[in-house]
């Protein structure tokens, strides 16, 4: 079976479909949740929806084999299997591994450490979001892009305030948080 990966945002409507056309005049078509839990089946010209957590929020298009699921949640994370029984008795199957992610929340920037060192301002900032597996990127007047939840930098004496932005992202969303410092080493605003 061919395996396709799909990542979507929770609460969205999703279409599970295959990239090729269905076998001509197939006999039966079934969508499964995991290996063997039936969601819907097409047989003898009609669709039968099974008692499952999807009942009432799925629809099958027998022409294309596409399965529409409304309002997906993280609990819908699974491998979905479409099995088609052809007229000659041979089976074909396609698998879609669906990953449902919540949109990332706005990050909170915390000052872990702030001290004056020889007229310079040493800063250690952390970008915090609750228990998510995300990517971090810091932007600002930095020698290089930092892809870490913690930013450590030293500010030379400066006239204007300096701002640092932490961007948290997963594959379906991203949010920014910004923290500014005014000279010499004063937290101005976030």
């Amino acid at each position: 079976g061919r395996l396709v990966h799909m990542t979507v945002v929770s609460g969205s409507n999703v279409t599970l479909n295959i990239s090729e056309s269905l076998p001509e005049n197939y006999k039966q078509l079934t969508w499964f949740y995991t290996f063997d839990q039936k969601i819907v089946e097409w047989d003898s010209g009609k669709s039968k929806y099974f008692e499952s957590k999807f009942k009432g929020r799925v629809r099958l298009d027998p022409q294309s084999g596409a399965l529409y699921i409304s309002k997906v949640q993280k609990e819908d994370n699974s491998t979905y299997v479409m099995r088609v029984l052809k007229k000659d008795g041979y089976e074909q199957e396609w698998k879609i591994k669906l990953q449902v992610l919540d949109p990332v929340p706005k990050p909170v920037i915390k000052i872990e450490k702030r001290e004056d060192v020889d007229d310079n301002c040493y800063l250690k900032l952390s970008c915090v979001i609750p228990g998510e597996s995300v990517n971090y990127t810091w932007y600002g007047e930095l020698p290089k892009e930092i892809q870490n939840s913690v930013l450590e930098t030293t500010l030379k004496p400066h006239k204007h305030s300096r701002c640092y932005t932490c961007q948290v992202s997963n594959s379906v969303s991203s949010k920014n948080g910004t923290f500014c410092f005014s000279p010499p080493c004063t937290a101005a605003r976030s």
């Epitope: 079976g1 039966q28 003898s44 698998k95």
Partner: antibody
Framework: QVQLVQSGAEVKKPGASVKVSCKAS????????IHWVRQAPGQGLEWMGI????????RYAQKFQGRISMTWDTSTSTVFMELSSLKSEDTAVYYC??????????WGRGTPVTVSS | DIQMTQSPSSVSASVGDRVTITCRAS??????LAWYQQKPGKAPNLLIF???SLQSGVPSRFSGSGSGTDFTLTISSLQPEDFGTYYC?????????FGQGTKVEIN
């Protein structure tokens, strides 16, 4: 010509385990299923479980849960079925069958397993 | 589990006779039914899948019908080589379950 070739007859003592192999020869499928079915002397057919060596999915009949295990060696296209804590009632011919999910278009010749003290 | 009940348990008929075996499922299985023939000392052989589709290489005297809970296997003109035990099997759900078998003997 696709064939399911099974290992030979086994004689076991009660409480022991037996491991039966089933090799899919001549097949070129990337995805196939192997079911295990047994038949006690003079009795009907009893489905034991299914495995898909391609993705590792396995499902056992409740009756055998806890003492059956299906494993595979994809490099040799061989599936194994191990049944433990054998009892005299496990005396049967054990068939592997496939290659479809829904029904069995191909069967091995069967492996007789005798459980006797 | 879905129970499969076959009848009759045995049938004795002459060459050329029409033989009918029925199979009843304890719940709706749509057309997820297969029929197998087994000869003594041999592995079963698939005859019919999806209730009515003839497996490749199986003689056309074998036919299957039915859907839901009631199914029939018909041998339109019994041949000497058709002796053996016939099993129905539901393929709708796990565990896959078989009927208890119908033994067909030639008079």
């Amino acid at each position: 010509q696709v064939q399911l070739v099974q290992s030979g007859a086994e004689v076991k003592k009660p409480g022991a385990s037996v491991k039966v192999s089933c090799k899919a020869s001549g097949h070129t499928f990337t995805n196939y299923y192997i079911h295990w079915v047994r038949q006690a002397p003079g009795q009907g057919l009893e489905w034991m479980g299914i495995t898909n060596p391609n993705d590792g999915n396995t499902r056992y009949a409740q009756k055998f849960q806890g003492r059956i295990s299906m494993t595979w060696d994809t490099s040799t296209s061989t599936v194994f079925m191990e049944l433990s804590s054998l009892k005299s009632e496990d005396t049967a011919v054990y068939y592997c069958a496939g290659l479809r999910y829904w029904f069995f278009d191909l069967w091995g010749r069967g492996t007789p397993v005798t459980v006797s003290s | 589990d879905i129970q499969m009940t076959q009848s009759p348990s045995s049938v004795s008929a002459s060459v050329g006779d029409r033989v009918t075996i029925t199979c009843r499922a304890s719940q709706d299985i749509s057309s997820w039914l297969a029929w197998y023939q087994q000869k003594p000392g041999k592995a079963p052989n698939l005859l019919i899948f999806a209730a009515s589709s003839l497996q490749s290489g199986v003689p056309s005297r074998f036919s299957g019908s039915g859907s839901g809970t009631d199914f029939t296997l018909t041998i339109s003109s019994l041949q000497p080589e058709d002796f053996g035990t016939y099993y129905c099997q539901q393929t709708d759900n796990f565990p896959r379950t078989f009927g208890q078998g119908t033994k067909v003997e030639i008079n």
